[in-house]
């Protein structure tokens, strides 16, 4: 049988039939269904939703749908002993207390089991002391405080505004600075777009709204008690003292009304510059401590949350491939939410649900994809990407041999301005070609392609006439697949206009106000942006699973490798004297990139010309494409981050959300001028150049003619 016969419908009609079956009204209906009650990881409500999704995916026509459960470390507030922060006077009396909960949104007043705002995995504690305002608590903010302003955070409680970087990095930085507690808050400068009403009248954050979130520094480990291995029935668990990535100091989040009360009394040093000022009507003094009249008052934290080993459930659906059933294309997104999950994750889960329904409809008509498609509804993403990571750990041997691609499907929207895509360079051409075939949903672009509106609104900084595609970082469920296993990965969603909206993420992120109504009233009333995201995600999965030759272009990797090599070289060249002193050369890396470029070019020529009717040669060429991403994996991992094994990309050591290129070299060079032993530090730079050059050369050789 030819591959076309096996899939029963002509290739062009396949994709069109799949896309035509996707309906905005269904996504809307699914979103409503998924957002009526909270679905916190580890709760009965989320288990029930898992079973509902399992049942519906079976009805939609998947071959099998199973629950995969794991017992992982989660964190919850104490129901009888709430977390809060006080201002105390010299007698220890509490003269101000922060809110214990967010005021519920209209229509949700009687909903039970709304978890109050908390920082997941915070240890218990009741530290008291002077406050220091640390801006965003980024690495550079602590450099400014400690090196320029000579402010010592040791023994202080720090208050940091959310935004710019992952909250776990903020906590890690505060710990390293010696702080004994961290208060996180949402400043209106970052979470309130001027001119828009706060919820329920608009999509802005009200003063009582608070962002929940985990504060782990897992570096890809998954369950903190079982790093590297699945948290199954016979797992050996570490003691809590040896758990991976747990914070050592109490942490708690608050809204800007409460933050105003803490910040308005701040004394000490003035903010170093305007970048340290938010939009509250307070001076943004750094401290330490309160001003004049209030100098005897202190801040006290009361944190009583507990860490508990709890059962979680992934839903794994399979649509078996007709021709290459042992090749897996995975579409996965999480199901667990902090509260209602109106955007995160259910705007993504509703899209996955509709994609499954469309594939199921085609399958019921006799069609099958060429390759196997796996669909996943992950649990406990909000607690550190736990569900996806445990499943990948359990199935790592299968995945590393059979995994073609992973497409992530968390929140479908974070705005309604234009498309946003982060993916491996192997998928650039796939994304470009697909978006040229899809209609833009944007006003003013009627009858135009998605590619056109995307390129106009979000142009590539390097290539004119092309859209921006970003590097993969982390903070979502693709992490284990891409950063640990080296499976080509991508993600797509609709986003805001980053030029005009400087706030971080979307204002109501991880708050109780992330409801169905938020989406239906303010972000996407017609669900046209959700439909477009479904078409992009689903279209990518379709092409990856069904195209005869995998839709990967290795030449695009060559282009970015040269760009990344140029970038890291220019960073190193800020230290010309040391490079000379310690004989640091990037020649090996540039040579390897040159070789990769030439070999990739020749491989692409062969890809055009080979006999596609020969199944052995076809499989061989496809395997070279599939395993190219794998070839960038270093089995030893990055220094001190064994589960980040991709040599070309890793989450930034300073911001988990951001991707860094040549991370081993980058980290070796970072702040190198402050290292106590320059010879050792530059030796590590040289070692990392060696590792990178070897890896690029080795990857290039996987694309050479096999004999």
């Amino acid at each position: 049988k030819s591959s076309n016969e096996a899939t029963n419908i002509t290739p062009k009609h396949n994709m069109k039939a799949f896309l035509d079956e996707l309906k905005a009204e269904n996504i809307k209906k699914f979103l409503y269904n998924f957002t009526q009650i909270p679905h916190l990881a580890g709760t009965e409500q989320n288990f029930q939703l898992a079973k509902q999704i399992q049942s519906q995916w079976k009805e939609f026509g998947l071959d099998s749908v199973e629950l995969a459960h794991y017992d992982v470390l989660l964190s919850y507030p104490n129901k009888t002993h709430p977390n809060y922060i006080s201002i105390i006077n010299e007698d220890g009396n509490e003269i101000f207390n922060t809110s214990l909960f967010e005021p519920p949104p209209p229509g949700y007043e009687n909903v039970s089991d709304i978890v109050p705002p908390f920082s997941a995995f915070s240890p218990q504690g009741m530290p008291e002391g002077d406050l220091v305002y640390v801006n965003y608590a980024r690495t550079e903010d602590f450099f400014k405080l400690e090196r320029d302003m000579k402010i010592n955070c040791s023994g202080k409680i720090v208050i940091a505004r959310y935004g710019k970087v992952f909250r776990g990095n903020k906590v890690k930085n505060a710990q390293l600075a010696g702080a004994k507690g961290v208060i996180l808050y949402s400043d209106p400068a970052d979470y309130f777009a001027p001119g828009v009403k706060s919820y329920p009248d608009g999509w802005n954050l009200p003063g009582g709204g608070v962002q929940r979130g985990n504060i782990l520094n897992l570096n890809g480990a998954g369950d903190p008690l079982t790093p590297g291995y699945p948290a199954n029935e016979y797992a050996y668990r570490r003691g809590i003292a040896e758990a991976v990535g747990l914070p050592s100091i109490p942490v708690h989040p608050i809204g800007y009304y409460d933050a105003q009360k803490l910040l308005e009394k701040m004394g000490g040093s003035a903010p170093p510059d305007s970048s340290w000022r938010g939009s509250l009507k307070v001076p943004y003094n750094v401290g330490p401590g309160f001003t004049g009249n209030f100098s005897t008052q202190k801040v006290k934290m009361h944190i009583h949350s507990t860490n508990e080993v709890t059962r979680i459930y992934n839903v794994i659906g399979t649509l078996r491939g007709a021709v290459e059933p042992d090749r897996y294309v995975i579409l996965g997104g999480h199901r667990d939410s902090w509260v209602f999950g109106g955007i995160d994750p259910q705007s993504g889960a509703a899209v996955v649900h509709e994609i499954v329904r469309s594939f199921g409809t085609l399958k019921k008509e006799g069609w099958r994809p060429r390759r196997t498609i796996l669909f996943a509804s992950w649990d406990a993403e909000e607690f550190g990407l736990l569900g996806s990571t445990e499943w990948a750990e359990e199935n790592s041997r299968l995945l590393q041999e059979r995994g073609v691609a992973y497409i992530n499907a968390d929140s479908s929207i974070e705005g309604n301005y234009t498309l946003r895509v982060d993916c491996t360079p192997l998928m650039y051409s796939l994304v470009h070609n697909l978006t040229k075939e899809l209609k833009s949903p944007d006003e003013g672009f009627e009858g135009k392609s998605l590619y056109e509106s995307w390129t106009k609104k979000s142009p590539s900084p390097e290539f004119s006439g092309m859209p921006r595609i970003s590097k993969l970082g982390s903070g979502n469920d693709f992490e284990v697949f891409f950063q640990r296993l080296g499976i080509a990965s991508g993600r797509a969603r609709y986003t805001k206009n980053w030029e005009t909206n400087k706030f971080s993420g979307y204002p109501l992120y991880h708050s109780v106000y992330e409801t169905y109504e938020l989406v239906e009233k303010f972000y996407d009333p017609m669900f046209k942006y959700h439909l477009t995201v479904a078409q992009v995600r689903g279209g990518m999965v379709f092409e990856l699973a069904n195209s005869i030759v995998l839709p990967f272009d290795c030449r695009d990797y060559a282009v970015v490798l040269r760009k990344y090599a140029d970038k890291i070289y220019s960073i190193s060249m800020k230290h010309p004297q040391e490079m000379k002193t310690y004989s640091v050369s990037f020649d090996s890396l540039f040579s390897a990139v040159k070789n990769f470029t030439e070999i990739a070019s020749k491989f692409s020529e062969r890809l055009q010309d080979f006999d596609k009717s020969n199944p052995i040669v076809l499989r061989m060429m496809n395997d070279q494409l599939m395993f190219l991403e794998r070839a960038f994996i270093d089995p030893l991992g990055l220094p001190d981050r064994p589960f980040y094994r991709h040599v070309i990309y890793a989450p930034s050591s300073h911001n988990k959300y951001a991707g860094e290129s040549f991370p081993g070299i980058y980290d070796a060079l970072f702040d190198i001028e402050s290292k106590v032993d320059p010879s050792k530090a530059w030796g590590e730079v040289k070692r990392q150049i060696y590792v990178a050059a070897f890896t690029v050369q080795a990857a290039a050789e996987t694309l050479s003619e096999v004999a």
Epitope: A189, G207, P283
Partner: antibody
């Protein structure tokens, strides 16, 4: 359409009183803070007073405290400024203005809708 | 009270010119700043809020920037209807205060 129509200006002797009115239409008056802003002849703008949506909070510039009273009647969609013990330096065009809560704190952000202005002259 | 100063106090310009007006606050006001245009005998009109956000219906040739204490209003290409007096206003703390104004007239 959204508008503010003013009345009540005129000539008054020093020490005298005057009441300015401002009628709102085209928007939900009770949802907005309201203000009075004045402009002396040939001079710049000076904020005079603010009043909260329900009238529970009022703020004044120091120079009018104890002499001027801002008030509102939400049922009539009207804003008032009662001016007592008037002085020559109170001579100005008085504008009523809607406070636009473009940011999280609605107590005094920007003035997006203005009345046409009414002249108050304090002279003997 | 927060004192607002503007410079220049007046500027003569021609149609098509780029005009920049600066406003300085006596203390940091974050982005709590608005800009107004006033023509003789008329009420002021809101142009810019939150230091850089363009009010609905205002032409895009007007733009605002700045944060903290220093702010700028820019008219990228002056049009005949733009000849007027421009005021900045802080809303960081009571009392709300305005700058003294900058008059833009025909060269």
């Amino acid at each position: 359409q959204v508008q503010l129509v003013q009345s009540g200006g005129g000539l008054v002797q020093p020490g005298g009183s005057l009441r300015l009115s401002c009628a709102a239409s085209g928007f939900t008056f009770s949802s907005y803070w309201m203000s009075w802003v004045r402009q002396a002849p040939g001079k710049g703008l000076e904020w005079v007073a603010n009043i909260k949506q329900d009238g529970s909070e009022k703020y004044y510039v120091d120079s009018v405290k104890g002499r001027f009273t801002i008030s509102r009647d939400n049922a009539k969609n009207s804003l008032y400024l009662q001016m007592n013990s008037l002085r020559a330096e109170d001579t100005a065009v008085y504008y009523c203005a809607r406070v636009w809560d473009y940011y999280y704190d609605s107590s005094g952000d920007a003035f997006d809708i203005w009345g046409q202005g009414t002249m108050v002259t304090v002279s003997s | 009270d927060i004192v607002m100063t503007q410079s220049p106090s007046s500027v003569s310009a021609s149609v098509g010119d780029r005009v920049t007006i600066t406003c300085r606050a006596s203390q940091a006001i974050s982005s709590w700043l608005a800009w107004y245009q006033q023509k003789p005998g008329k009420a002021p009109k809101l142009l810019i809020y939150a230091a850089s956000s363009l009010q609905s219906g205002v032409p895009s040739r007007f733009s605002g920037s700045g944060s903290g204490t220093d702010f700028t209003l820019t008219i990228s290409s002056l049009q005949p209807e733009d000849f007027a007096t421009y005021y900045c206003q802080q809303a960081y703390s009571f009392p709300v205060t305005f700058g003294p104004g900058t008059k833009v007239d025909i060269k």
